[in-house]
Amino acid sequence: IIDGAPCARGSHPWQVALLSGNQLHCGGVLVNERWVLTAAHCKMNEYTVHLGSDTLGDRRAQRIKASKSFRHPGYSTQTHVNDLMLVKLNSQARLSSMVKKVRLPSRCEPPGTTCTVSGWGTTTSPDVTFPSDLMCVDVKLISPQDCTKVYKDLLENSMLCAGIPDSKKNACNGDSGGPLVCRGTLQGLVSWGTFPCGQPNDPGVYTQVCKFTKWINDTMKKHR
């Protein structure tokens, strides 16, 4: 997260980290006791999922292995359209004050809405500095018309843009798949942006979760 600050303790109990061994790979969100939602470009063969602590490496955190993941069938490695994936935990997460399910959206939030993006990704770019504590930054949803002025035909209609004019505030590497939460509901998953991260007036691009609630529910039901 660029130009952010540590999240208020316990304010993001649905936030998870997907680890490869002990190394941060991506962010994600807990949908229920068995399922994590993340970005399709975060696909690996096996995951270790960190839940229940804002601090990576915290021994009090839950660590659960996951071996099954289901990319959206329409994901494209060229255009990154439909950049979302469900990861099935090998054992159930224990819900607590620090481990809660995210609220999936019942509607798409409009441009101008203030949202929070969070993650353990690098806080500097191109030099990398990985924090141990979960970082947050507030950004505003940007209309597709305004975002298309920047990204032209790279922008697909299930992509959501967010940023702050003339500001560096943005996600970065390691934040992929993590949540963009607006008014208490999950509206986006970190998908992509320009490099180095945090270039003013280059919005972050997110998978627009409100367009995929049916696929999320159907996929969890299908692979119970």
């Epitope: 191109p126 990398v128 490099f195 691009v205």
Partner: antibody
Framework: QLQLQESGPGLVKPSETLSLTCTVS??????????WVWIRQPPGKGLEWIGS???????YYNPSLKSRVTISVDTSKNQFSLKLSSVTAADTAVYYC???????????????????WGQGTTVTVSS | DIQMTQSPSSLSASVGDRVTITCRAS??????LNWYQQKPGKAPKLLIY???SLQSGVPSRFSGSGSGTDFTLTISSLQPEDFATYYC??????????FGGGTKVEIK
């Protein structure tokens, strides 16, 4: 300003292993979110990608060379290296090291352009 | 593997001419296409990345366009220092990263 410099023997015998090193100055190889790349150019021919390594040590190889190639990083010396085994005359080329600049973060981080190059070193395979 | 086909393989032009080089990918590569200039005995130099973005320090007479499978490098007014070989390069999600065969721009 980042600079790259290739070094290694200019002559290698057939069936032996070619070993080259690229020394990076003006930036730390282990803390920069870039790819570190090896490319070669046979005499009078075009460019061929050999492989790449990122700051975390993940490697990516050209499938046509994969069985013979190893790329590694020595962070203490700020270097990355290339080993190409069982060489033949067809491996005679100018070998370049380069920095791969990602075209974005997240899903666009896997794509890159080589924005800084070494000057190249000529390797001849001959007995 | 994705094949990159450049045309023409060589061309002769005069100072001040507008020069266009094309690069075609065997399948869609979105905008993940970069252009390089190489002079004899020198390393390649990045000119254009992401199909149309001008690399810092490169003169504005160079421009790139295209998306999907067809891409173009244009030199609006050829200068003496532009006589060189030009390569396109696609940056893939899966290896290998591949280059076009090159276009040699010579003095007419």
């Amino acid at each position: 300003q980042l600079q790259l410099q290739e070094s290694g023997p200019g002559l290698v015998k057939p069936s032996e292993t070619l070993s080259l090193t690229c020394t990076v100055s003006g930036g730390s190889i282990s803390s920069l979110d870039y790819y570190w790349v090896w490319i070669r150019q046979p005499p009078g021919k075009g460019l061929e990608w050999i492989g790449s390594i990122d700051y975390s040590g993940d490697t990516y190889y050209n499938p046509s060379l994969k069985s013979r190639v190893t790329i590694s990083v020595d962070t203490s010396k700020n270097q990355f290296s290339l080993k190409l085994s069982s060489v033949t005359a067809a491996d005679t080329a100018v070998y370049y090291c380069a920095r791969g600049r990602p075209l974005g973060y997240g899903a666009r981080h896997y794509y890159y352009a080589m924005d800084v190059w070494g000057q190249g070193t000529t390797v001849t395979v001959s007995s | 593997d994705i094949q990159m086909t450049q045309s023409p393989s060589s061309l002769s032009a005069s100072v001040g001419d507008r020069v266009t080089i094309t690069c075609r990918a065997s399948q869609s590569i979105s905008s993940y296409l970069n252009w390089y200039q190489q002079k004899p005995g020198k390393a390649p130099k990045l000119l254009i990345y992401s199909a149309s973005s001008l690399q810092s320090g490169v003169p504005s007479r160079f421009s790139g366009s295209g998306s999907g499978t067809d891409f173009t490098l244009t030199i609006s007014s050829l200068q003496p220092e532009d006589f060189a070989t030009y390569y396109c390069q696609q940056s893939p999600y899966f290896p290998p990263l591949t280059f076009g065969g090159g276009t040699k721009v010579e003095i007419k």
